[in-house]
């Protein structure tokens, strides 16, 4: 039974040209994390593998930094970065848990962070 839950940073906004940290946290399960994938829609941004460490997709190398922890830092944000981001936890023996974050990149300087919320 997949008992775990993923807590994410939820709906967040940030300023164009700035940076943002995407974070997920898996709880309420005894399962062991082997790999975490970060995806934007259908594009792979980065992988954090238990043995191999971090791999950032070549097309994002200049603007994506690993961490903190299993999170991901997006830098030099553009309006085109607005959209859905997914953290996909590959765990033993439960399988995959997926968390969703919606990022809005704003032109103005009034970007505010959304509240944290639970994804079952």
């Amino acid at each position: 039974m997949m008992t775990g839950t993923i807590e994410t940073t939820g709906n967040i906004s940030a300023e164009k040209g700035g940076s943002i940290i995407l974070q997920c946290h898996l709880s309420s399960t005894t399962a062991q994390v082997t790999q975490v994938n970060w995806e934007q829609q259908d594009q792979l941004l980065a992988i954090c593998n238990a043995d191999l460490g971090w791999h950032i997709s070549p097309s994002f190398k200049d603007r994506v930094a690993p961490g903190p922890g299993l999170g991901l830092t997006l830098q030099s944000l553009t309006v085109n970065d607005t959209g859905e981001y997914f953290c996909i936890y590959h765990t033993y023996p439960d399988g995959t848990y997926t968390g969703r974050i919606f990022l809005e990149v704003l032109e103005s300087s009034v970007a505010e962070h959304g509240a944290r919320f639970q994804i079952p």
Partner: antibody, heavy 119, light 109 residues
């Protein structure tokens, strides 16, 4: 390369306990779960449980609950499985196997430890 | 507890293709059962071939492939080699425990 090396064969009397070890090398021990599986002579495989090597939390198959204890020594990358109140039906080869969450399952296996229970 | 069933024995000619299946007494096998296939040769350690239905293990030849077929998990060996003669076990995950099948003895003849 990944290796799981188990302790040697044991002969035990009914009612006794046995402790089998599984020493891992070639990877970061605390990044992957460890399973214990047994195979009685001429029989199939039976899963006994697994232990989260990061938290140390074990999960036991219902059949072995109360009789099996799975532990770790992370300083030596070794997993242990202790089975108590042994009976003749526990005569089997006991295997450790690594649990991988990327494509869920057991990817590497130890060579096995024969435990014979006989009076 | 669920019962996992496999063909007791199968024979394939060298270079031929053979499919081993793995069924569940609880109904159709799905990706949630994370079907595993392991190979056992006499006097050798078990070798993990397939994990998570179709994930080939490290160093496992491409002739081994896993899938779901007609409500069962399947292991297909395309272009069987003499060294593929072995016992093959499948394992299915049922919420909180693994159950192994009885094994298939594959003969390459």
């Amino acid at each position: 390369q990944v290796q799981l090396v188990q302790s040697g064969a044991e002969v035990k009397k009914p009612g006794a306990s046995v402790k089998v070890s599984c020493k891992a090398s070639g990877y970061t021990f605390t990044n992957y779960g460890m399973n214990w599986v047994r195979q009685a002579p001429g029989q199939g495989l039976e899963w006994m449980g697994w232990i989260n090597t990061y938290t140390g939390e074990p999960t036991y198959a219902q059949k072995f609950q109360g009789r099996v204890t799975m532990t770790l020594d992370t300083s030596t990358s070794t997993a242990y499985m202790e089975l108590s109140s042994l009976r003749s039906e526990d005569t089997a080869v006991y295997y450790c196997s690594r649990g991988n969450g990327y494509y869920v399952g057991m990817d590497y296996w130890g060579q096995g430890t024969l435990v014979t229970v006989s009076s | 507890q669920a019962v996992v069933t496999q063909e007791p024995s199968l024979t394939v000619s060298p270079g031929g293709t053979v499919t081993l299946t793995c069924g569940s007494s609880t109904g159709a096998v799905t990706t949630s059962n994370h079907a595993n296939w392991v190979q056992q040769k006499p006097g050798q350690a078990f070798r993990g071939l397939i994990r998570g239905t179709n994930g080939r293990g490290s160093g496992v030849p491409a002739r081994f492939s896993g899938s779901l077929l007609g409500g069962k998990a399947a292991l297909t060996i395309s272009g069987a080699q003499p060294e593929d003669e072995a016992e093959y076990y499948c394992a299915l995950w049922f919420s909180n425990h693994w159950v192994f099948g009885g094994g298939t003895k594959l003969t390459v003849l």
